[in-house]
């Protein structure tokens, strides 16, 4: 955690770092470690990648324990093989308007991600890509035989875009806030970020919050009922304390997590809220971090690693964040 103790390095020599990740001396000058990357958690011992102009942003002077790797002010962004200047806006595709800010890209949808529930007029709603149209549109498959109305199919469930409009006009400032990014980890503690100018000076700034989609140790597939393919929001039996680099949350939380599917779908946060969580460290220091809390999850086929560089990320975003 800190550098007060003697140097203790893992027995094996230098670790093997993934491609593009620097091998650096830890912050104590003791051991060689793989540098933390943009948006990852960092500590004095776990430094950020200096070759990418990253530094460990502890958020406030009071908290010197755990930070987030952040690009220095004005750092450019590399997105889809193109370099964008900090402050530059661009359309990643016809579907998304993006902004680069100090090495982080925040994007907002240009297409509606509305849902449609079945009705007599549209018993089998589907979203489809129509020729010559950028955004998918709803089509209503009529039943083959109009006299036989079978059970309505489940509505096409994308994550929703409800809650306050992210674009507001306020005193000569067009307030824009991107959606929270997907959690950087599919299990365990990760980071979620967004870009906003919703502040007194109307300046773009990055915000980050801790997030946990599900605990890594939970074997959720065991809980899927016979005949079912998914467990969307598994019941958490007991309140838990969150752990963050050796520090433990002061309070216990009956948090909701997202489940899993056995049919290739992935379950991701659907509606979330952001709340402050206090962590107490072994040396007695207390620090406050914003954290994502899940209200509902959705299971869908738009899983990480799908074709579109941004779309697979976008569909895993947390919408409708409720304060």
């Amino acid at each position: 955690q800190n550098c007060s103790g003697p140097c203790r390095c893992p027995a094996e020599q230098a670790p093997r770092c993934p491609a593009g990740v620097s091998l650096v001396l830890d912050g104590c000058g003791c051991c060689r470690v793989c540098a933390k990357q943009l948006g990852e958690l960092c500590t004095e011992r776990d430094p950020c990648d200096p070759h990418k102009g990253l530094f460990c942003d502890f958020g406030s002077p009071a908290n010197r324990k755990i930070g987030v790797c952040t690009a220095k002010d004005g750092a450019p962004c590399i997105f889809g093989g193109t370099v964008y200047r900090s402050g530059e806006s661009f359309q990643s595709s016809c579907k998304y308007q993006c902004t680069c800010l100090d090495g982080a890209v925040g994007c907002m949808p240009l297409c509606s991600m509305d849902v449609r529930l079945p009705s007599p007029d549209c018993p089998f709603p589907r979203r489809v890509k129509l020729p010559g149209k950028c955004c998918e549109e709803w089509v209503c498959d009529e039943p083959k035989d109009q006299t036989v109305v079978g059970p309505a199919l489940a509505a096409y469930r994308l994550e929703d875009t409800f809650g306050p409009d992210p674009t507001m006009i306020r005193a000569n400032c067009l307030v824009q806030t991107t959606e929270w990014s997907a959690c950087s980890k599919t299990c365990g503690m990760g980071i979620s970020t967004r870009v906003t100018n919703d502040n007194a000076s109307c300046r773009l700034e990055k915000q980050s919050r801790l997030c946990m989609v599900r605990p890594c140790e939970a074997d959720l597939e065991e809980n899927i009922k016979k005949g079912k393919k998914c467990i969307r929001t598994p019941k958490i039996s007991k309140p838990i304390k969150f752990e963050l680099s050796g520090c433990t949350s002061v309070k216990t939380y009956r948090a909701k997590f997202c489940g899993v599917c056995t049919d290739g779908r992935c379950c991701t946060p659907h509606r979330t809220t952001t709340l402050p969580v206090e962590f107490k460290c072994p040396d007695g220091e207390v620090m406050k971090k914003n954290m994502m809390f899940i209200k509902t999850c959705a299971c869908h086929y738009n899983c990480p690693g799908d074709n579109d560089i941004f779309e697979s990320l976008y569909y895993r975003k947390m919408y409708g964040d409720m304060a």
Epitope: S112, V115, R116, S119, P120, W138, C140, G150, A152, A154
Partner: antibody, heavy 114, light 110 residues
Framework: EVQLQESGPGLVKPSQTLSLTCTVS????????VHWIRQHPGKGLEWLGV???????DYNAAFMSRLTISKDTSKNQVSFKLSSVTAADTAVYYC????????WGQGTTVTVSS | ETVVTQEPSLTVSPGGTVTLTCRSS?????????ANWVQQKPGQAFRGLIG???NRAPWTPARFSGSLLGGKAALTLSGVQPEDEAEYYC?????????FGGGTKLTVLG
């Protein structure tokens, strides 16, 4: 963001025609139908009629003779006309989107009185 | 005239389970009635919770589930929260028109 907004006169004289407009944003009325529902003070909901995405209409049989629902797709607006109104038509009138009645307007209060 | 009947009021304790039902006067409710459930909280606008018998709207928590139960449409709330206190209306489709039920006032104790 999906929104529906009802507008029209708050006061209508008996025997006249009540005209309301539902202005829609965040979705297209050529993709979703729009329903009209009313609620008498302290009472439940009463379904009045619907204009479907393709322009067809269905009405509550009790209002068939005096209700007309139409739409202007270019303006994304649905209009509601109820003729020969009486005091019994005093209510809060709502428009709601088809598909689970998922989105509703805030409602507009209509009083029928001379 | 078709009548759709709901329990006028129900009371439940936080964390409990409650089932609201929607009965049709002309026979069993089926999937072709496209049962819808609409919620109104005090001082708030109406919003749809369930459409097409069992499909949840995106904002509808997983503790709400729609089904057909003994020839009636049913809305089951498991693990009831204080914020679930509201008026709930069902609406059934009859080939050419919808009919709303009289509504159920759900009270959450505590």
């Amino acid at each position: 963001e999906v929104q529906l907004q009802e507008s029209g006169p708050g006061l209508v004289k008996p025997s006249q025609t009540l005209s309301l407009t539902c202005t829609v944003s965040g979705f297209s009325i050529s993709t979703f139908g729009v329903h009209w529902i009313r609620q008498h003070p302290g009472k439940g909901l009463e379904w009045l009629g619907v204009i479907w995405r393709r322009g067809g209409t269905d009405y509550n049989a009790a209002f068939m003779s005096r209700l007309t629902i139409s739409k202007d797709t270019s303006k994304n607006q649905v209009s509601f006309k109820l003729s020969s109104v009486t005091a019994a038509d005093t209510a809060v009138y709502y428009c709601a989107r088809d598909g689970g009645f998922d989105y509703w307007g805030q409602g507009t209060t209509v009083t029928v009185s001379s | 005239e078709t009548v759709v009947t709901q329990e006028p009021s129900l009371t439940v304790s936080p964390g409990g389970t409650v089932t609201l039902t929607c009965r049709s006067s002309i026979g069993a409710v089926t999937t072709s009635n496209y049962a819808n459930w609409v919620q109104q909280k005090p001082g708030q606008a109406f919003r749809g919770l369930i459409g097409g018998t069992s499909n949840r709207a995106p904002w509808t928590p997983a503790r709400f589930s729609g089904s057909l139960l003994g020839g009636k449409a049913a809305l089951t709330l498991s693990g009831v929260q204080p914020e679930d206190e509201a008026e709930y209306y069902c609406a059934l489709w009859y080939s050419t028109h919808y009919v709303f039920g009289g509504g159920t006032k759900l009270t959450v104790l505590g």
